[in-house]
């Protein structure tokens, strides 16, 4: 029961996480820049992985896509790649984990197969989460190192003087969504891996059985080529080949190491 709960919870957490990674990747607010001191209109500039937008206080918003790969930083391309890899791995992981769920019966699928599928999806979720966290962190680092401060003008009055000031380029909402989503996917993956251990069937110890012939005190010796009859050359009941069975004289009520395989 605990295994099913762990697996189910892991699946749900990962599902939420991957939905968050997709949302973060599509969002425009990866970075934001505020220019509130503009005397014309307050301009809110925000950028995503795929397009850049400018919103004015009047409500007018203009968004333009990055139609060229040239001129875009390699880091931005790397972030795009990491996020896409994270989504693809997560999606495959979700597909695999659906069939691995203990509560879902698909034909005569054995628990060992479900355990393997659970582990596979768990690993995929972990890698997916790490990709998202890495992508978001790389973008955040790019912001801090390259574009954290940007020069802009500040107008001291409607007809006043103009002076140059620094405006901050801050983390957008998408970064936080990405971090949280990546973390959830990672946690979900770990839960799936834990559930896998509970799903795997444990090895059973089977007791060895001695088979006795009905006549002439003949003991069947597995693996041996002769059976002792108690007569003839082997009158002292010497062991000819001990494959786990014994002659009647040797059979005792107490257990020995040969009783277990």
């Amino acid at each position: 029961m605990a295994v099913t709960a762990c697996q189910g919870l892991g699946f749900v957490v990962s599902l939420i996480g991957i939905a968050g990674i997709i949302a973060a990747t599509c969002m425009d607010q990866w970075s934001t820049q505020d220019l509130y001191n503009n005397p014309v209109t307050a301009v809110f500039n925000y950028q995503g992985l795929w397009r850049s937008c400018v919103r004015e206080s009047s409500g007018f918003t203009e968004c333009r896509g990055y139609f060229t790969l040239l001129g875009l930083p390699a880091m931005l391309q790397a972030v795009r790649a990491l996020m896409i890899v994270g989504i693809v791995l997560g999606a495959i992981g979700l597909l695999v984990s659906i069939f691995a769920l203990k509560c879902i019966r698909i034909g005569s699928m054995e628990d060992s197969a479900k355990a393997n599928m659970t582990l596979t999806s768990g690993i995929m979720f972990i890698v997916s989460g790490l990709c998202a966290i890495a992508g978001v962190s790389v973008f955040a680092n790019m912001l801090v190192t390259n574009f954290w401060m940007s020069t802009a003008n500040m107008y001291t009055g409607m007809g006043g003087m103009v002076q140059t000031v620094q405006t901050r380029y801050t983390f957008g909402a998408a970064l936080f969504v990405g971090w949280v989503a990546g973390g959830l996917t990672l946690i979900g993956g770990v839960m799936m891996c834990i559930a896998c251990r509970g799903l795997a069937p444990e090895e059973t110890n089977y007791k060895a059985v001695s088979y006795h012939a009905s006549g002439h005190s003949v003991a069947y010796k597995p693996g041996g080529f002769k059976a002792s009859t108690g007569f003839g050359s082997n009158t002292k009941n010497k062991k000819i080949y001990d494959g786990g069975a014994r002659t009647e004289d040797e059979v005792q009520s107490y257990p020995s190491k040969h009783d277990y395989v």
């Epitope: 970075s31 820049q33 220019l35 503009n38 014309v40 209109t41 301009v43 500039n45 950028q47 397009r51 850049s52 400018v54 004015e56 206080s57 009047s58 409500g59 007018f60 203009e62 333009r64 896509g65 990055y66 001129g71 875009l72 930083p73 931005l76 574009f147 940007s150 020069t151 802009a152 003008n153 140059t164 405006t167 380029y169």
Partner: nanobody
Framework: QVQLVESGGGLVQPGGSLRLSCAAS????????MTWVRQAPGKGLEWVAG???????NYADSVKGRFTISRDNSKNTLYLQMNSLRAEDTAVYYC???????????????WGQGTLVTVSS
């Protein structure tokens, strides 16, 4: 980079009119706000008028009712129609644009080289 080139300045009599133009060129991604700023001889920079891409415009009190700002978004060009010019309007007029050369770049300020407007009889 974004380049701004002003034109239309010159000598005009008080009460006369003049039309300034500012053409933006280069690797322009977005120009949300364009403004005119002037610098009278021996004085600091003074903001005159500005217009956003959405059409919001604003004017300094000293030019309200006399100056009209407009822009052609398709040509990335800013205009300033100056009527009823006074001697105190004599200054070098600079075009200023808050623009980004690439989408992932923050909005930055770009300036023209300026055009001289002299109001004298």
């Amino acid at each position: 980079q974004v380049q701004l080139v002003e034109s239309g300045g010159g000598l005009v009599q008080p009460g006369g009119s003049l039309r300034l133009s500012c053409a933006a060129s280069g690797s322009i991604f977005s120009i949300p706000v364009m403004t005119w700023v002037r610098q009278a001889p021996g004085k600091g920079l003074e903001w005159v008028a500005g217009i956003s891409k959405g059409g919001t415009s604003n004017y300094a009190d000293s030019v309200k009712g006399r100056f009209t700002i407009s822009r052609d978004n398709s040509k990335n060009t800013l205009y300033l129609q100056m009527n009823s010019l006074r001697a105190e309007d004599t200054a070098v007029y600079y075009c200023n644009a808050q623009a980004s050369s690439f989408g992932w770049m923050p909005l930055s300020d770009y300036w023209g080289q300026g055009t001289l407007v002299t109001v004298s009889s």
